[in-house]
Interface confidence: low
């Protein structure tokens, strides 16, 4: 017996004020800027048998909100008003007919931030859980775009480089996607939370940047990630150069990259004494090479001009000729920036600077 | 559309009150952060004090801290603009805004303003 005395005050105690009307929902949920998260809530009311068949009817308010004057910012009541700023971006996604509260934020913007609380309405059954509150805080948009480069980039051949934002939530508004790039462009097919840049890359582009730029509207939030393009050109008598990474970590697949990032000191090492064993094999045969060589000129690829909006000045340096091996193997970083190795063909050699022009593509 | 009536501007000593009041008419009214803005002679339009659609939250210039209350009824569909101590630098048209637009960061719609004259 006095232990069923005592069950009114534990639930008075860890679910607050009325042992018959109580709530359980997280006290703080964190939400990134222009993203979205979802709440799990249950609520428990009586019933009585008068209000037995009545509709029952939740709302999200926000704190300090008085219920007769101010509108909740959201519910399931179809006339109800609700906030204008939280219009569309709130929605109480839980049934509250099965004790679900559960409440759905997208888009979320910095003036979401505060504590917000729920009310039940059954017929003459009404109560407003002050306690425990929803606290939410919107943070800094920190994610970035993911730009995928599936293979590496030749000049004259078309690829079809990804940007996506896999993290972003399917229920918030589609973002929009701008790309930024000095290489010959046109859009690809694009999904929800993905573009298609197809870029068919010349010679000069080698080193370029290349942005992915992600406006979420809803919010008013932007992020971007900028890759250096790697033109790599297959030829039959290569050289080994290194080009280092961007140093923006390793979530995309970079262009040019030979097998992959060379990994590890051992395999370096061992890549470096192939190379030696093959340059002074492929030295014999150099002269009759250089003759091929020059005999392929034409398949530099034509620098056709745009409007000159944003021009940037890029140079294709021509290979030098090394008699040794030194210092030719790539080293792997500890940190976040990589080191990839590309080719580089002998016969080509640009007399003068080409000027790139930088396009800017947008996506809706 | 939402169609903003400003009243209650007029002449003033200095040290005395009025109250603004703005009717809106048209769509649904709780929902809109609104404002009071003002623009005297020569000057750029600045904002006074505005609320969220909610009543909770109120913001004002600082020039006006202490002596002026924003405030709506939602139901009557009105914003006032409390205003005590006046001063002779309050001389201005004063505007009614409603629905805070946060893309352009400006107010969608505006009534056609109210004139008052702070003068000994």
């Known amino acids: 017996m006095p232990l069923l005395l005592l069950l009114p005050l534990l639930w008075a105690g860890a679910l607050a004020m009325d042992p018959n009307f109580w709530l359980q929902v997280q006290e703080s949920v964190t939400v990134q800027e222009g993203l979205c998260v979802l709440v799990p809530c249950t609520f428990f009311h009586p019933i009585p048998y008068y209000d037995k068949n009545s509709p029952v009817h939740g709302y999200w308010f926000r704190e300090g909100a008085i219920i007769s004057r101010d509108s909740p910012v959201a519910t399931n009541k179809l006339d109800q008003e609700v906030q204008e700023e939280t219009q569309g971006r709130f929605r109480l996604l839980g049934d509250p007919s099965r004790n679900n509260c559960s409440l759905s934020i997208v888009d979320a913007r910095r003036r979401d931030n505060g504590s917000y609380f729920f009310r039940m309405e059954r017929g003459s059954t009404k109560y407003s859980y002050k306690s425990p509150q929803l606290s939410v805080h919107v943070t800094d948009l920190t994610h970035r775009p993911k730009i995928l480069i599936p293979g590496t980039l030749e000049p004259g051949h078309s690829k079809n480089l990804t940007c996506s934002v896999s993290w972003a939530c399917e229920q918030g508004t589609p973002p929009i996607f701008s790309w930024l790039s000095a290489a010959p462009t046109s859009l690809g097919p694009r999904t929800t939370h993905s573009s298609v840049l197809i870029i068919t890359p010349r010679p000069q582009d080698h080193g370029t940047n290349l942005t992915c730029q992600v406006k979420f509207a809803g919010a008013g939030v932007t992020t971007e990630r900028t890759i250096q393009l790697n033109v790599t050109y297959v030829p039959q008598n290569p050289t080994t150069g290194i080009f280092p990474g961007d140093g923006s970590g390793k979530q995309e697949t970079r262009a040019g990259v030979v097998h992959g990032a060379i990994g590890g000191a051992g395999v370096t090492a061992l890549l470096a004494l192939c190379l030696c064993l093959i340059f002074f094999i492929v030295k014999t045969h150099r002269r009759k090479a250089a003759r091929t060589a020059v005999g392929r000129n034409d398949t530099h690829p034509t620098t056709g001009s745009a409007s000159p909006k944003h021009q940037k000045k890029s140079k294709l340096h021509g290979p030098t000729e090394t008699s040794s091996c030194s210092g030719a193997a790539p080293t792997v970083e500890m940190d976040e920036e990589l080191h990839y190795a590309s080719l580089n063909f002998h016969g080509m050699n640009p007399s003068k600077d080409t000027s790139t022009e930088y396009s800017e593509v947008r996506t809706q | 559309e939402v169609q903003l009536v400003e009243s209650g501007g007029g002449e003033v000593q200095p040290g005395g009150s009025l109250r603004l009041s703005c009717a809106a008419s048209?769509?649904?009214?709780?929902?809109?952060?609104m404002g009071w803005f003002r623009q005297a002679p020569g000057k750029e339009r600045e904002l006074v004090a505005r609320?969220?659609?909610?009543?909770?939250?109120?913001e004002y210039a600082e020039s006006v801290k202490g002596r002026f209350t924003i405030s709506r009824d939602n139901a009557k569909n009105t914003l006032y603009l409390q205003m005590s101590s006046l001063r002779a630098e309050d001389t201005a048209v004063y505007y009614c805004?409603?629905?805070?637009?946060?893309?352009?960061?400006?107010?969608?719609?505006w009534g056609q303003g109210t004139l008052v004259t702070v003068k000994p």
């Open positions: 048209g769509r649904t009214f709780s929902g809109y952060i």
């Open positions: 609320i969220s659609g909610n009543n909770l939250a109120t």
């Open positions: 805004a409603a629905e805070y637009d946060y893309s352009s960061g400006d107010f969608v719609y």
